[in-house]
């Protein structure tokens, strides 16, 4: 049985065509902002504003930058080392249960309840019963929803889990 061959033992028979700015990998990995070449000999920089990588890696490509959808504002742009950060517009919020969409905040509390928390990009207004002070977990009324990307979620070309 022959042992697994390391990349140092193997000479690629054909090299990929020159691409972006290159540097050498460190212990087989490329730094954030880069991906590795097919032959594992070069680190190729991600394209600013197009794709990125956040960690040391040996991936063949950088991850595609998220585009903020309508209904979202861009808090910070995509760089070669960090994905775009998007946030729901004022008056809308993103729930943990449905992070793919911004929902409109309620305009007021149901009768017999008082508002104790404002609408934020990550939470609806918070209502409590006037007497007991217990939180209200009523359904958000049906609203026109804009499907959006989750903030900081890499919009990669496809799922690695297939």
């Amino acid at each position: 049985e022959s042992a697994l061959i390391t990349q140092q033992d193997l000479a690629p028979q054909q090299r990929a065509a020159p691409q972006q700015k290159r540097s050498s990998p460190s212990e087989g990995l490329c730094p954030p902002g880069h991906h590795i070449s097919e032959d594992g000999r070069d680190c190729i920089s991600c394209k600013y504003g197009q794709d990125y990588s956040t960690h040391w890696n040996d991936l063949l490509f950088c991850l595609r930058c998220t585009r903020c959808d309508s209904g979202e504002v861009e808090l910070s742009p995509c760089t070669t080392t960090r994905n775009t950060v998007c946030q729901c517009e004022e008056g809308t919020f993103r729930e943990e249960d449905s992070p793919e969409m911004c929902r409109k905040c309620r305009t007021g509390c149901p009768r017999g309840m008082v508002k104790v928390g404002d609408c934020t990009p990550w939470s609806d207004i918070e209502c409590v019963h006037k007497e007991s002070g217990t939180k209200h977990s009523g359904e958000v009324p049906a609203v026109e929803e804009t499907v959006t990307s989750s903030p900081g979620t890499p919009a990669s070309p496809c799922s690695l889990s297939g």
Partner: nanobody, 121 residues
Framework: EVQLLESGGGEVQPGGSLRLSCAAS????????MGWFRQAPGKEREFLAV????????YYAESVKGRFTISRDNAKNTVYLQMSSLRAEDTAVYYC????????????????WGQGTLVTV
């Protein structure tokens, strides 16, 4: 969903030749490598060869260099392993696999695997 389907395995006489095929579907990565491995009974899975889709870079294991040739058909999303001068020690289950990592000659660098096709010499 990524699917890999190997074919072409079978019984062959020592010194004979065989061509294995691996058809891939569901691959939407910007670049990837398709590799061949084999596993004989009671032995570890062994890397044989890999070919990359964008640049066509190819790697072979020393144990098969000169006897085995890896090639691809981009239009059919299929990779081939042409095996010649086969010997008894080439008897194994041959697996096709996909990697999204560079210079991928280790088993752990592969994310997707086919079911395998048996080659008996």
């Amino acid at each position: 969903e990524v699917q890999l389907l190997e074919s072409g395995g079978g019984e062959v006489q020592p010194g004979g030749s065989l061509r294995l095929s691996c058809a891939a579907s569901g691959l939407t990565f910007p670049n990837y490598g398709m590799g061949w491995f084999r596993q004989a009974p009671g032995k570890e899975r062994e890397f044989l060869a890999v070919i990359y889709w964008s640049g066509g870079t190819v790697y072979y294991a020393e144990s098969v260099k000169g006897r085995f040739t890896i090639s691809r058909d981009n239009a059919k999303n299929t990779v081939y392993l042409q095996m010649s001068s086969l010997r008894a020690e080439d008897t194994a289950v041959y697996y096709c696999a996909v990697t999204i990592r560079g210079a991928a000659t280790q088993t752990w660098k592969y994310d997707y695997w086919g079911q395998g096709t048996l080659v008996t010499v």
